[in-house]
């Protein structure tokens, strides 16, 4: 709100721009015939200090000189960096109701002289780009500071550009707008940056460079790859580059990888052969360029080329297992199962599996292809059968994996001993065993196989298995292991033509069952009572049931009930008890026990034995 200084003037000594820590004198003078009245003694000049448009101080007490009614001089000290506004006002003491009238104002800028610019760095992006330099200006000056970038070179080449820094913009980079060409490759150029403001000036040290020092090639473009004879492991990477490029750096990696393969290529001329690619793998390729073998800078990495290498025929062998069951008097059903190859073995999209089932002596052969990882056939029970499976993609098939079809649990002498299953954590079970005691043929391998103890489809829910070398006696099973589910686990010992197995049940985590078995009937036969029940539904078992308990007590009795504990067997659903008195009414119920504890009781049934009990 400063009028155009009609009433007077304000001046600053030594200047309106001062170094940090300096004092200044501000004089406020009224023009002739300006003032409150014809009595000069009633004119009072005051000085107000504003920072960011906010009044921060009345400098009435800082007067150092006063010509009553005409002019006053104030000394200001401890000014902070930046700009401070001072406004002189006229206060008419005989009219206290009127506010002071503005006379004039002045801005004082406090700052520092510029430091010599440092760390000059110049670049020219590409052979056809222009030279741009950047620098570190040093401490903020808080004043408008002009920077001049000067370049000099051979053949009296000179060039300069300017910019300024103030509180709104920063000047630490300038594009000179000139292009250095490759024919000046050996020439030396000098740049210098000069900084000037009202408090002083400074210059950088001269910075010397050559064409090669500053020209950063453009990143390669138009990147493509050609796979030789549709090979999945060999390809020629091609790209476009600026003409002067002599060195390239290539980096490539599978998309899910975290580390790059790096290659340096000299005089590649936009072409490089790669020989170690993985077939049927998504890769990312990038290229960088340099104009000189020893000096100069690398370009930025090119845009990525993302592509998938072609397929190659599968390698590796399938992990096969099987299940056999007799389905009538002279036929058996063989269900073959196998695990998918991992991507590095499949080397492409597996289109189908070739399955062969062969009777060795009669040379009967059944062959088929399937897209599934299982295959089932009914074959005669007689003869020695062998199975083989291979995986095929668009380029070919893997070598077939063979397995002899033997009676997996047929040889007691091959049965592993002391099989145990111990829960390790929520999702795995440690299975351990001892080798067969009197095997009449050498164990070639162990197979640990497991299935959930709940109803499932033979073909829809294949078994899970692990192959274990013959010198190992333990396996940690984790595939498809869920807490609170009981698994039947078999350890098979396989020789060339025989198999023996041992079974155990195990779970990874257990709770007490939700309920007890449901007693369905109590019958009396030959002075014994038979208790029949239905098993607890699988979801309510919550782990492996170790045993059932049958409780009974006389009706209305307050005594502790008697109980009979029976080993859990899924095939058993009745049990005899013989210690009940005839013509006494009893209440009976059942519970189930896991390693975590006992279930609540199942339903209660009353029964009064009639016959003579033991």
């Amino acid at each position: 709100n400063i009028d155009v200084c009609k009433l007077g003037t304000v001046t600053v000594q030594p200047a309106p721009v001062i170094p940090l820590g300096s004092a200044a004198n501000i004089s406020c003078s009224l023009n002739p015939k300006q003032g409150c009245s014809h009595y000069p003694s009633s004119n009072e000049l005051i000085l107000l200090k504003f920072v960011n448009d906010v009044l921060v101080e009345n400098l009435h007490g800082k007067k150092v000189h006063d010509h009553t009614g005409h002019s006053s001089t104030f000394q200001v000290t401890n000014l902070s960096l930046g700009m401070t506004l001072f406004v002189c006002k006229l206060n008419c003491s005989n009219s206290q109701k009127k506010p002071p009238v503005p006379v004039c104002g002045v801005e004082i800028s406090v700052g520092v002289a510029p430091e010599p610019p440092q760390n000059i760095s110049c670049v020219q992006e590409g052979e056809n780009g222009t030279v741009a330099c950047s620098w570190n200006s040093g401490k903020v000056t808080y004043l408008k500071t002009n920077y001049t970038l000067q370049l000099s070179g051979p053949n009296n080449l000179t060039c300069q550009k300017q910019c300024f820094s103030d509180n709104r913009q920063n000047c630490n980079r300038l594009d000179l707008g000139i292009n250095l060409s490759p024919d000046l490759a050996e020439s030396r150029f000098i740049v210098r940056v000069t900084a000037i403001n009202d408090l002083g000036n400074s210059s950088s040290l001269p910075h010397t460079f050559t064409f090669l020092d500053i020209v950063i090639p453009l990143p390669p473009w138009d990147i493509r790859i050609n796979f030789l004879n549709a090979s999945g492991s060999r390809g020629t990477l091609q790209w476009e580059d600026e003409g002067q490029v002599v060195l390239n750096q290539l980096r490539y990696q599978p998309l899910n990888s975290t580390s790059w393969n790096m290659v340096n290529a000299t005089n590649a001329k936009g072409k490089y052969d790669l020989r170690d690619l993985r077939p049927f793998t998504e890769y990312e390729f990038q290229i960088s360029s340099k104009l000189h073998l020893s000096g100069g800078s690398w370009s930025n990495w090119s845009e990525s080329l993302r592509t998938r290498t072609p397929e190659e025929e599968p390698v590796g062998i399938l992990d096969i297992w099987y299940m056999k069951q007799d389905i009538d008097y002279d036929r058996q059903q063989i269900s073959l199962f196998w695990k998918s190859l991992n991507p590095s073995e499949a080397r492409g999209k597996i289109l189908h599996y070739q399955v062969t089932l062969q009777e060795v002596t009669k040379k009967t052969t059944l062959q088929n292809t399937t897209r599934h990882t299982s295959w089932t056939r009914v074959i005669p029970r007689t003869g020695a059968w062998t199975a083989s499976v291979s995986a095929a993609n668009s380029k070919g098939a893997s070598a077939p994996t063979h397995i002899n079809i033997v009676d997996l649990c047929g040889t007691g002498l091959l049965a592993p001993h002391q099989v145990s299953a111990k829960s390790e954590n929520m999702d795995n079970i440690l299975v351990t065993w001892q080798p067969p005691k009197k095997a009449d043929s050498a164990v070639r391998e162990y197979i640990v196989e497991w299935r959930a103890l709940q109803p499932g489809s033979i073909t829809k829910f294949p078994p899970h298995w692990l192959r274990i070398p013959p010198d190992n006696m333990s396996a940690l099973i984790s595939e498809n292991i869920k807490p609170y589910i009981c698994y039947e686990i078999r350890v098979h010992a396989l020789s060339e033509s025989q198999g023996g197995c041992s079974s155990i049940r195990g779970d990874s985590k257990h709770k007490a069952p939700v309920s007890g078995p449901h007693i369905t009937a109590i019958t009396e036969k030959k002075e014994r009572l038979f208790i029949s029940w239905t098993h607890i539904p699988f979801p309510e078992q919550r782990g492996c049931i170790l045993h059932y308990r049958i409780y009974w007590k006389e009706r209305d009795s307050t005594a502790q009930p008697e109980l009979c504990e029976i080993q859990y067997r899924r095939s058993q659903n009745s049990h005899p008890i013989s210690s009940l008195q005839p013509r006494v009414t009893y209440v009976l119920w059942m519970t189930a026990v896991t390693a975590a504890g006992e279930s609540p009781q199942g339903n209660e049934r009353e029964f009064c034995p009639q016959g003579k009990a033991n």
């Epitope: 399937t370 599934h372 299982s374 499932g456 033979i458 073909t459 829910f461 899924r570």
Partner: nanobody, 119 residues
Amino acid sequence: QVQLQESGGGLVQPGGSLTLSCTASGSIFAIDDMYWYRQAPGKQREFVAYITATNSANYLDSVNGRFTISRDNAKNSVYLQMNSLKPEDTAVYYCNAKQIVGFQIDEYWGQGTQVTVSS
């Protein structure tokens, strides 16, 4: 438990056709592997055909090409289409379902339906 009910049997002339049906009820959530068996008078029960959860089928050699097994999951039913029937196909035909619990196979049987091939 699972209950199986066959139907569709009867008397047919040699060269004729019949379609047997089997409908499952009860706890059938895990019954995916369905079979047909037959038992001729004075002979042991023999496997005829099966169909798996993935609709893969297999047949007794002597009926292969003449009989076709199929299923309709929405109706919990399995069918045996029998063409070019011969007198030696005369038997009681049984529907069978198998499921596995651990390593134990549970089997369920229907009561059978009589097929007689005679002129």
